[in-house]
């Protein structure tokens, strides 16, 4: 079958990194500069992705594979294949249309990305606040007052960590 296909379509013999040049009797020609073909039998080469501005080059384009970008420091990748770059903020902040803004009282963000999330409400688990929350850190819940009374045999283990919030993508 492969031999038959080759006889019918000479382009199928063109390897990755080349294209089947209709202008030259379907000879396999190398991809021009700044282009690539990642599979054989291509009739054109694809233009290499350019990593510029907010993007920087993580992997150079070759004749057989596209360039890969990441983000210039101060920004982080979003989307498949780093299709976008989003601004970093400091811990204790979240990104808004107006840029990085401090977390409101009662919320925190311990990362350079994502949104400010409410402090854990210790009382919902019958616990007390052991360490106060800040813009950068969640509160630490301690044992309930009852657990600290004389004769209490053991300290209640801390509540399991909540699933952290994620930056919308």
């Amino acid at each position: 079958f492969e031999r038959t296909r080759s006889l019918q379509d000479p382009c199928s013999n063109c390897p990755a990194g080349t294209f089947c040049d209709n202008n030259r009797n379907q000879i396999c020609s190398p991809c021009p500069p700044n282009s690539f073909s990642s599979a054989g039998g291509q009739r054109t080469c694809d233009i290499c992705r350019q990593c510029k501005g907010v993007f920087r080059t993580r992997k150079e384009c070759s004749s057989t594979s596209n360039a890969e970008c990441d983000c210039t420091p101060g920004f982080h990748c979003l989307g498949a294949g780093c299709s976008m770059c989003e601004q970093d903020c400091k811990q204790g902040q979240e990104l808004t249309k107006k840029g990085c803004k401090d977390c409101c009282f009662g919320t925190f963000n311990d990362q350079k990305r994502g949104i400010c999330r409410p402090w854990t409400n210790c009382s919902l688990d019958g616990k007390s606040v052991l360490v106060n929350g800040t813009k950068e850190r969640d509160v630490v819940c301690g044992p309930s007052p009852a657990d600290l009374s004389p004769g209490a045999s053991s300290v209640t283990p801390p509540a399991p960590a909540r699933e952290p919030g994620h930056s919308p993508q």
Epitope: G53, V54, F75, L78, G79, S83, M84, C85, E86, Q87, L95, T96, K97, S167, P168, Q169
Partner: nanobody
């Protein structure tokens, strides 16, 4: 091909003014939020300003508020940054950048940017 090309940079004295332009081709400018970002020598990238599709919303980083003005002319597929009362710390390469699909709703990601134009503030 989607492309952004900045121009208008140059050498200016402290206190002076400069107007940067960004020409957009290969897409309809009026469909997108647009941004200016900058990179000072040896520093990371810093967001400067953004503007919504029709120019009714504009936001700035605190350090340029009241000195810089972002604007757009969708009919000319152009974005602008008017910079006045320039300071040495404004020295940077300035890039215009397009807000990706869903910008301001799902994320604040930038998906296309230009090569940049250099602004040097020095006496």
């Amino acid at each position: 091909q989607v492309q952004l090309v900045e121009s208008g940079g140059g050498l200016v004295q402290p206190g002076g003014s400069l107007r940067l332009s960004c020409a957009a081709t290969g897409f309809t400018l009026s469909n997108y939020w647009m941004n200016w970002v900058r990179q000072a020598p040896g520093k990371g990238l810093e967001w400067v300003a953004n503007i919504n599709q029709d120019g009714s919303e504009k936001y700035y980083v605190d350090s340029v508020e009241g000195r810089f003005t972002i604007s757009r002319d969708n009919a000319k597929s152009s974005l602008y940054l008017q910079m006045s009362s320039l300071r040495a710390e404004d020295t940077a390469v300035y890039f215009c950048a397009r807000g990706g699909e869903g910008y301001g709703v799902d994320h604040y990601g930038l998906d296309v940017s230009g090569q940049g134009t250099t602004v040097t503030v020095s006496s």
